[in-house]
Interface confidence: low
Amino acid sequence: DSSKWVFEHPETLYAWEGACVWIPCTYRALDGDLESFILFHNPEYNKNTSKFDGTRLYESTKDGKVPSEQKRVQFLGDKNKNCTLSIHPVHLNDSGQLGLRMESKTEKWMERIHLNVSERPFPPHIQLPPEIQESQEVTLTCLLNFSCYGYPIQLQWLLEGVPMRQAAVTSTSLTIKSVFTRSELKFSPQWSHHGKIVTCQLQDADGKFLSNDTVQLNVKHTPKLEIKVTPSDAIVREGDSVTMTCEVSSSNPEYTTVSWLKDGTSLKKQNTFTLNLREVTKDQSGKYCCQVSNDVGPGRSEEVFLQVQYAPEPSTVQILHSPAVEGSQVEFLCMSLANPLPTNYTWYHNGKEMQGRTEEKVHIPKILPWHAGTYSCVAENILGTGQRGPGAELDVQYPPKKVTTV
């Protein structure tokens, strides 16, 4: 409508007792420059006088005189574009409607702006993303519908009452579209932050507390598990029983499935929180863990290394090297699967025990023809003595000896 003055400013401005209010404002008059400006508080039109009644907070006429009691109200505008205002300090009874009565040479206009002044500093508002997942970076936003050049404030983030170490980015807006102070904090929540309290605290320039907003974090995370084993050292002997228990220390949302894994492979038909292994065999040695899933995904416990101890199995002998040339060196290695490892070995040459040879390896530095034959061994650990295996044959090569002509 070309018959109207055009104004742009925030519809409502918010402040509290003792703070200030900065009103960004632009206008375009219908004709010529502004000649008179009056700022009313709660103006009412009087039909009898054809004028507005109400408290005059500020008055500027062609003479440019401003009464001294209006010092807290400042018109920071000009005669054709800017109508920005400042009230410092602002009081509770300033709440209501501000009326900007503008007059040019031939035209008049009343522009209304709402002012909401609270008794105490009002709290900021924390905005969280719709869903927060562990280890995924999110931005926490704290928004306060207030900003004023004459009243510096700060927004501080706290986690469980302790300042958060992450750097927050604070921005302010004092435009004709919006007036606010905003703090944004990038944060990678861990599962242990679930249920914790985050606070955005409004403080004055000296760090004095003014107000706050709090939220409780709802951090979605995979199940967190603890595995317990009986016996606690997870060392058993063949034929013993083992019980493993899986405990869920935290899950959000609730868990849905349970399974057990051995060496990374799922154990069939083991879908409860207790794994009972009866009369274990050595093949059941390995790394066990429990896996519990929820809508976020699977969670795994730490691995328990189950050691099933058993007496040595029948041993085999490895010879380095056979056939051997007379005068060369040879090493024999006794190999036997056992848990714990064998502590003692007995060596045999052609069925006869080799005295003083109790190690896993036997080293002969200089081979003679009589060293040829079958070598076998027996391994021994705390659980018993193994059986003697088939042994290995040492072939000794040597040059002709005591040559006789026939």
Partner: nanobody, 124 residues
Framework: QVQLVESGGGLVQPGGSLRLSCAAS???????MGWFRQAPGKEREFVAG????????YYADSVKGRFTISGDNAKNTTYLQMNSLKPEDTAVYYC??????????????????WGQGTQVTVSS
């Protein structure tokens, strides 16, 4: 360096009461504090714990209804009010602080800092 200092131990008759205090030096953040005890010739065992975020408390079955753990997170202080004391409560009582969440509050290995201990003797 964080230090935990216990106080309030002493000799008390069966049925009597004692209040133990544990103060953490310096300004640092912990998420939970707990009390453990060790009787002569026995392993150290969990007594009570408190989580600051919601003031949730945890107790060993043997002390439930008799002992109360409380505290002031702002001051990094925890208290153990022990009522209806029995001779079997005789032990050195240790205060512990959990700085990072590690799971169960009744497991010794989940606590980062320990006090030197205060002796509690219940005897007639």
């Amino acid at each position: 360096q964080v230090q935990l200092v216990e106080s309030g131990g002493g000799l008390v008759q069966p049925g009597g009461s004692l209040r133990l205090s544990c103060a953490a030096s310096g300004s640092w953040f912990n998420i939970a504090m707990g009390w453990f005890r060790q009787a002569p010739g026995k392993e150290r065992e969990f007594v009570a714990g408190i989580r600051w975020s919601d003031s949730k408390t945890y107790y060993a079955d043997s002390v439930k209804g008799r002992f109360t753990i409380s505290g002031d997170n702002a001051k990094n202080t925890t208290y153990l009010q022990m009522n209806s004391l029995k001779p079997e409560d005789t032990a050195v009582y240790y205060c512990a602080a959990q700085r990072y969440y590690r799971g169960s509050y009744n497991r010794q290995t989940n606590y980062d800092h320990w006090g030197q201990g205060t002796q509690v003797t219940v005897s007639s």
